[in-house]
């Protein structure tokens, strides 16, 4: 929970944040986990600690290892761990999987690619962007603040995008690169009035008191990427977040695209430790898009647990 993976390339800057968060006024001490040796705070060192941040300016392959951060309040010390790996620069263009940040998806209407980890650095615009190692040129590409915007996105725009920027520390400049994959969602399609596949209208769902129960709200909205489509649950006409019952939470399911190409969404309502009062609530599965809103209502009824004695006696 309080251990975090970080990675970078040799001869580039790498800044890592302590995964154990505290108040801004708390002090943070950093150590090499293997040796328990304190990491200096003096900025003249290549590797130094600066509050919640550990800075490698620049990083070396030998810096790889686990670093301990101890956040100290006036009365408590709490520990976090940063697992740092520094890799040699690749001679060829391919960026290996272990250097990739999370994949992002875009479409014609939303094509922002954020530069990973950039908020940790002292950088100035503009960012440089590369796709598959080629510098991006042309009016379709706009570097804006910490992200890249691609106009009129096409499926050919999918690929690995690298942002490159300069971190400045006390007048010295250090290069930083970060790469993530970009996928393009198919924009061709149509939109129609929501069709709720589950639950059925006025369905009665049997549940056992004291057990957990799941209700799935599943609806389809058309074909291809949908501009506005949502499924959600309401309790007695109130949003789950406003209802204020921590036992009852909704959790987005997978975006589904069935074999017929329909764009569908799931929302799972999880009820932990079902109570008698839950049987009195009205559960509404709502599906909405630009065409309108459709509602299916579900009620819970008590399922009598099987008496195993009567079966086996």
């Amino acid at each position: 929970k309080f251990s975090k993976q970080s990675w970078g390339l040799e001869n580039e800057a790498l800044i890592v944040r302590c995964p154990r968060q505290g108040k801004p006024s708390y002090t943070v001490d950093w150590y090499y986990s293997q040796t328990n040796k304190s990491i200096p705070t003096q900025e003249r060192n290549r590797v130094f600690a600066s509050g919640q941040l550990l800075k490698f300016l620049p990083a070396a392959v030998a810096d790889s290892g686990i670093y301990t951060c101890i956040v100290r309040s006036p009365t408590f010390n709490r520990t976090g761990y940063a697992n740092v790996t520094i890799y040699k620069k690749q001679s060829d263009c391919n960026v290996p999987d272990y250097l990739m940040y999370s994949t992002v998806s875009g479409s014609e209407k939303n094509s922002k690619i954020y530069c990973p980890t950039i908020d940790l650095y002292n950088w100035t615009a503009p960012l440089e962007w590369f796709k598959n190692c080629q510098a991006l040129q042309g009016s379709r590409y706009r570097a804006h603040k910490s992200f890249l915007v691609i106009d009129n996105v096409m499926t050919e725009d999918a690929g690995d995008y690298t942002c490159k920027f300069i971190h400045n520390e006390n007048g010295a400049n250090y290069s930083v690169t970060a790469t993530r994959s970009f996928t393009v969602k198919d924009e061709q399609g149509f939109s129609l009035f929501p069709v709720i596949g589950a639950p059925a209208q006025n369905e009665i769902k049997e549940v056992e008191i004291g057990k957990n129960a799941n209700l799935t709200c599943s609806a389809c909205f058309g074909k291809g990427t949908q501009f506005l489509a949502a499924v959600l649950w309401q309790l007695n006409g109130t949003k789950i977040t406003d209802f204020g019952e921590p036992r009852i939470q909704q959790e987005e399911g997978q975006n589904q695209s069935f074999s017929n190409g329909l764009a569908c969404l799931d929302m799972v309502l999880r009820i932990a430790d079902v109570k008698e009062e839950d049987l009195l609530l009205q559960y509404d599965c709502l599906a909405l898009n630009l065409h309108g809103l459709r509602r299916h209502t579900v009620r819970l009824s008590r399922k009598n647990p099987i008496d195993h004695h009567s079966i086996y006696c």
């Epitope: 929970k1 505290g22 108040k23 009365t75 709490r78």
Partner: antibody, heavy 123, light 107 residues
Amino acid sequence: EVQLLESGGGLVQPGGSLRLSCAASGFTFSIYDMIWVRQAPGKGLEWVSTIKGEGGGTYYADSVKGRFTISRDNSKNTLYLQMNSLRAEDTAVYYCARDPWSTEGSFFVLDYWGQGTLVTVSS
Amino acid sequence: EIVLTQSPATLSLSPGERATLSCRASQSVDDDLAWYQQKPGQAPRLLIYDASNRATGIPARFSGSGSGTDFTLTISSLEPEDFAVYYCQQYITAPLTFGQGTKVEIK
């Protein structure tokens, strides 16, 4: 020195209301999460409610949700627990306590506790 | 909610003996577990936080260990003032929950 002093307890009939107060001193009250914990006679500890620091969210135990309201007045360094629709099972010593770490969206231990105030719900 | 089960319910020991108290969580709480001591008529006192760290002013004879679902509070050599009720508490998520307590009494 950190001090927490509860008041407002007493005897109340079922269905009645009470408002507990907790006066805090010796620390910057506004930045800390504050908590109510209760203990029925001869029983264990039960968390009742938490209010996050700096005007943050509130959290309640199932057993009191919809009946109890936690609030704070940072200008008065005071924590409150408004208890409505009281039941016999709410009879307990009510402690206020401080969460000394209290970052957004997380919880921690209770490092300072008051001495408690007894609430008795009986007809 | 996360249920914490403490064992034994009562521990009868003599001063100078070693006390081992157990706390088991119904699901993982990582190291987000604390131990408290409560004496009759008093508020609880924090002993251990983050499963194994002693709170300020707590004697070294108190130690905590464990991670995930199984935790132990050890009192290496019982002093007369250690006879009390001990509670574990998880704080990984709301609702915060306590164990039912272990009473350490004089044999």
